[in-house]
Each structure stands twice: as C-alpha cells, then as structure tokens.
C-alpha cells in the first residue's frame, strides 16, 4: 500500500523554540515514522533536518539547527516505513517573520504602598532577538487578587514601580513583551502575584519637584512629619530600559544627603545633559520611609521651562492677567520657542478654595471676582508637545485687591 | 563561569595594616558592586561596606568607618580591602561578594583567614 | 541600623522532618531578604532571595516566605547535608545587616 504524505504542517517559533507539528494522514498505518528536509533560499540541494529525522511522533523540535533568522527556508515532510510516501512541501518562511516572542520572565518585590517589577526577555541571550534585545518594551495587566478589576499599563521597560497600591493586600500581575518595530506582541507571562507588606511607619516623601534658579536646581518636597533627615538619589533613566541590568545604581547627590528640609540645592553642573529619575527617601534617626515615587528630570526641558511672569491689571470684578516670558538671572527674558499652555490658579486670600483656569493664550480673564477683595494669583507653564510632557513650578503668587464696584468697562 | 577568587590567609602583627584582594573571574566587576563581609569564629557575619568599581563610589558601615577602605581596579577586574591599625578583634574570615540588584550576594569568595597575633 | 533577629540558636531536627527557621527585622524591608546556609570551613551559600524566590540549583525542599519585618525558611524533608547554619540577611537599606544564625542538628 502507498504511503500517504503528512499534510497540515504547522511550524511554531517561540523565541528560539522551532517546533514543527503535522497530521497523520493515515491514522490506520502503524508503526510510521516521519523525516523533514531543508532547504535555504538560493540552495538547490535539500539536507536532513537535525532533531526532525525518523519522529514517531506527529511533532518534533529544531532549535538546534543553527540558522539565519532573517533568511527564507523551505521544508519538506515525508512519511516512512518499509516505503516512503512523496514529500510534502511546506510554504517557505522567514523564521524572524514567523516567530513569536515568549513569555517574559517576572520578578517582584513588595513595598507596603508599592511593588517593583524586574521584567526579562523568556529566553537569554536569544538568537532571535538578538538586534533587537533593546528594543522590547512590556506591557502588564494588574488587580487586586480579592476584586479581579484589572488595569493595564502599557509601554513599560525592564524595571517598573507601580505605587499608590493598597497595604498588606496580594495583588496579581501578568506581563508580555512586544516589539513594536516589527509589528510583534508576545505572549503573556505565568500569572504572579504578591502581597503588599504592613504599612511602614514612615511614608515616602511626596510631590517632589525641581526648579531653576540662578545655576543651582531647587529640589523641593512635601513631608508629613518635622525633625526629620532626607537623602536624594539619582539614576540615568536609560538603564531603566537595559533588560540585562537588574542592578540599578543610584547615586547620591552630594548636597542633599541628610538634609534637615524638605528641599535642597545643587548646582546645574552636576548634571550633563540628559534625563535621570530622581527619588527622596526620609529618616528620622531610628526609622527610614521607603523611596518615594522617582520623578523624571531632563535637564534640557528643565533648564528652559521656567515659571511665567505675569502682570495683573485689577478691575471691579476681574484680573486681566498678561503673561510674559520669564526672566533669567541678569533680568533678561528666556525664549521659549516651543507651544506652551498655562495653568492660572487664583484664591480669595482669606479662603483655600482654588479655582483654576487653562489657556494657551498670553492674556487672559479671570472672572467673576467680588469688588475690593484681596485675590491671590499663582501660573505655571506646560509644554503642549506629548514627548516633552513637562510643567513649570509655579511662580510666586501675587496677591492684588479688586476695584470698587463699577469699574468694569 | 562565575567565580571570585581571594587572596591567601596571613598572619601578621597588631599595629600594622594589610590589602586583601579578590579577583573576579567570568563577569566584569564594572557591572556589579562588590561587598566586602566579616566573619569571626562561632560568629555571625557582618557587613562591611561596598564599591561601585565603576567609578570608584563606596559605601561603609559604622563600625567599620576609618578601619576599613574599599577600592577595585577595574584593569585587573580586582576589588581589594584594606584594614589598619589591626587588633586581634580583626581576626577573622573576609569574604568579598558580588551583589547583583534584587538578587543580592549571588556569589561568595572562598574567604582570606586573617590572624592578628603578636 | 536594622536588626534581624534569629530568635532560635540551635533548631534540633530528623531526616524527613519540615522545619521552620524565622527572621525578625526591625524595621519594615520590603522583600529584600536573602537566606544563605553555611557549612563548618565554607563560604556561604546563598538559598533565597527577595524572601521568596529560590536561587538556581537550590533544591526545592528550600522555600522562603515572608515580607515587610517576619521571614521564614522552610526546609521540608530535611537531608542529612541540609544540617548547617542558616542566615538571614537584609538589603533594603544601608548598613546591610545579617542575623546571628540557626544551626541545624540531628536530635
């Protein structure tokens, strides 16, 4: 009796896992073995498959083949036994076309109000991904194990915190790999989960920001308690997206270690040109709070994205506030030659009520004031471009009375 | 593969000071920072302080602060600690340690017996 | 500086038995706990890190558990090269910190 050829083959790249499946076409033939050959673009002879000879079974693996990744192949299947049937050719394939990026390899590490999350390619030092080992970038999917609402978080790099998280609560994660220039989104990870440790007795420090004046950076933060002692740390923000790097050094900036404020001073030639993640943590002498949340501080937005200057004209039940560049050390005006969007905010000053106002324009209306009250006025820049998605602090407020009634025109 | 390899065990006299070494093997100390750790006999290990050999940044424990001084040199891929004004409450194992981020000390040196005795 | 805290000196055990060996710290440290076991003449060896996540080569019977200031060891059916000290350590801030040690003895 003619043997059948196999039919259906199916070829499964996983990182560097090359797995090959295919149907029986005869299930009542026992006792028959299958054999793949190979064939690379511009070759006219055909060679054995290593790992792919004799299979009794209807898969087998050829990861050991080394091959070109990026170049065409063509394989062929036959069945045997005391005869053999045809070949059966399978349509030819890039493996780097057809690959699949794996699971990626998971590692938590539990805060009372944080996790941090060490993520790296499934397979080391992969063939595959190779040129591209730079390049992945990961997203996750995280809940509350008790609730199962799930939040996604998108475009994230080998070391991820996530914060504002609940204490002593187990919370779950999964996490996959993507190659967004070849279009490639992997597979998701294992489900791993942790639970948040008891609430430390320090909080981190909070809303820290950077500032510029003169030549020095003005780091400021808010802080619970008083008596307290501060360090500062730094870290170029690339090595965050280094997937073989789990050690992340940070370094301390010498004029804010153990300060007594909540805010410190450095000069700007501390830093090169470039973008690092800045952190805060608190002592009081016994005890130390965990790292605050890392702010991201790039030196060229920071050096030119100072707070507005503005002028407040008072009528009856109005400020017409003109805002202008804002002025260096020496007085002269800095240009800013990119779109920016400012955030005015204003108070009655004997009230905390805040109210505020956003307009792109240079001079704008705040309306609706009562007559001859003192209003408090503070503006902040943004920078309207999603890349350099950076604020000023605010400037100064300026406290002005209204007019008597009727002075509106 | 991995592996640290310490210098030989010494004996020497109260007073004086002495650099051991630990020379790395099968990674580049420049990625790593490498600890230095103390241990006494029937004793618990202690910390002692560790260097950032990329740019030489070190870090020390109280105790140890004005005793001990931690320096590499990357050429040899070598981190080396030295201690002065030896006692015998300075006789002990030192080992040095590779620390690797969330993994910690990943790998040991086999330790340099110490031995302050006059 | 963070204390850990090995409350037991001396933990007697059998071949076959489960044993817990526990750490205390002082202050909350997150995850960042080792556990290394050391034989008599020999540099340690590191078991778990991030208190729970076994290093390659450990043999399963070692699992970590534990976060915030407890940790715990376990050794289930214990071996006779399991019989050793073991260590807790710290490093989730600086001065890193070590507990005193738990040997482990046939009864």
């Known amino acids: 009796k003619n043997l059948k050829s196999p039919q259906k083959v199916e070829v499964d790249i996983i990182d560097d896992n090359f797995i090959l499946r295919w149907n029986r076409s005869d299930e009542s033939v026992g006792n028959v073995t299958f054999s793949f050959d190979y064939q690379k673009t511009g070759m006219d002879n055909w060679i054995k498959l290593s790992g792919c000879q004799n299979i009794t079974s209807t898969k087998c693996n050829f990861s050991s083949l080394k091959l070109n990744v990026y170049e065409e192949i063509k394989l062929r299947i036959r069945a045997e036994k005391e005869n053999t049937s045809s070949w059966y050719e399978v349509d030819s394939f890039t493996p780097f076309r057809k690959a699949q990026i794996g699971p990626p390899e998971v590692h938590l590490e539990a805060e009372d109000k944080a996790i941090v999350i060490h993520i790296s390619p499934g397979t080391k030092d992969s063939v595959m991904w190779a040129l591209d080992g730079l390049s992945f970038t990961y997203s996750l999917v995280i809940w509350k194990n008790s609730s199962g609402v799930e939040e996604r978080i998108e475009n994230i790099y080998s070391r991820h915190k996530i914060y504002k998280l609940s204490p002593e609560t187990t919370y779950c994660l999964k996490v996959k790999a993507a190659l967004l220039t070849s279009w490639k989104i992997g597979v998701y990870s294992p489900v791993h989960c942790i639970k948040t440790t008891v609430e430390n007795e320090l909080p981190p420090p909070e809303n820290i920001e950077v500032s510029v004046q003169n030549q020095n950076y003005v780091l400021k933060w808010d802080y619970t308690y008083a008596n307290m002692t501060f360090q500062v740390q730094w870290l170029h923000a690339f090595l965050k997206r280094n997937p073989g790097n789990h050690l992340y050094k940070w370094k301390q900036i010498p004029d804010c270690e153990n300060v007594k404020t909540t805010q410190c001073v450095f000069p700007q030639n501390v830093f090169q040109k470039g973008i690092y993640l800045l952190r805060v943590q608190a002592s009081d002498g016994n005890n130390t709070s965990f790292w605050s949340e890392e702010i991201k501080f790039d030196t060229e937005i920071q050096a030119f994205l100072l707070p507005p200057v503005f002028n407040i004209r008072s009528l009856s039940d109005s400020f017409h506030i003109y805002i202008g560049a804002p002025k260096q050390s020496g007085n002269t005006p800095v240009i800013q030659d990119y779109p920016l969007i400012y955030e005015i905010i204003f108070w009655e000053n004997t009230s905390n009520a805040e109210r505020k106002i956003i307009e792109k324009k240079t001079d704008v209306t705040v309306p609706n004031l009562k007559p001859l009250t003192v209003y408090c006025v503070k503006a902040r820049a943004h920078t309207m471009d999603e890349k350099l998605n950076k604020s000023s602090v605010f400037s100064d407020a300026v406290c002005e009375k209204t007019k008597p009634g009727n002075t509106s025109k | 593969e991995v592996h640290l390899q310490q210098s030989g065990a010494e004996l020497v006299k109260p007073g004086t000071s002495l650099k051991l070494s630990c020379t790395a093997s099968g990674f580049n100390i420049k990625d790593y920072y490498i600890h230095w750790v103390k241990q006494r006999t029937e004793q618990g290990l202690e910390w002692i302080g560790r260097?950032?050999?990329?740019?030489?940044?070190?870090k020390y424990a109280p105790t140890f602060q004005g005793k001990a001084t931690i320096t590499a040199d990357t050429s040899s891929n070598t981190a080396y600690l030295q201690l002065s004004s030896l006692t015998s409450e300075d006789t002990a194992v030192y080992y040095c340690?590779?620390?690797?981020?969330?993994?910690?000390?990943?790998?040991w040196g086999q330790g340099t017996t110490l031995t302050v005795s006059s | 500086d963070i204390v850990m805290t090995q409350s037991q000196k001396f933990m007697s055990t059998s071949e076959g038995d489960r044993v817990s060996v526990t750490c205390k710290a002082s202050q909350n440290v997150g995850t960042n706990v080792v556990w290394y076991q050391q034989k008599p003449g020999q540099s340690p060896k590191a078991l778990i890190y991030?208190?729970?996540y076994r290093y390659s080569g450990v043999p399963d019977r070692f699992t970590g558990s534990g976060s915030g200031t407890d940790f715990t060891l376990t050794i289930s059916n214990v071996q006779s090269e399991d019989l050793a000290e073991y260590f807790c350590q710290q490093y989730n801030r600086y001065p890193f910190t070590f507990g005193a040690g738990t040997k482990l003895e046939l009864k």
């Open positions: 260097i950032d050999p990329e740019d030489g940044e070190t």
């Open positions: 340690a590779r620390y690797n981020g969330y993994s910690g000390f990943d790998y």
């Open positions: 991030s208190a729970s």
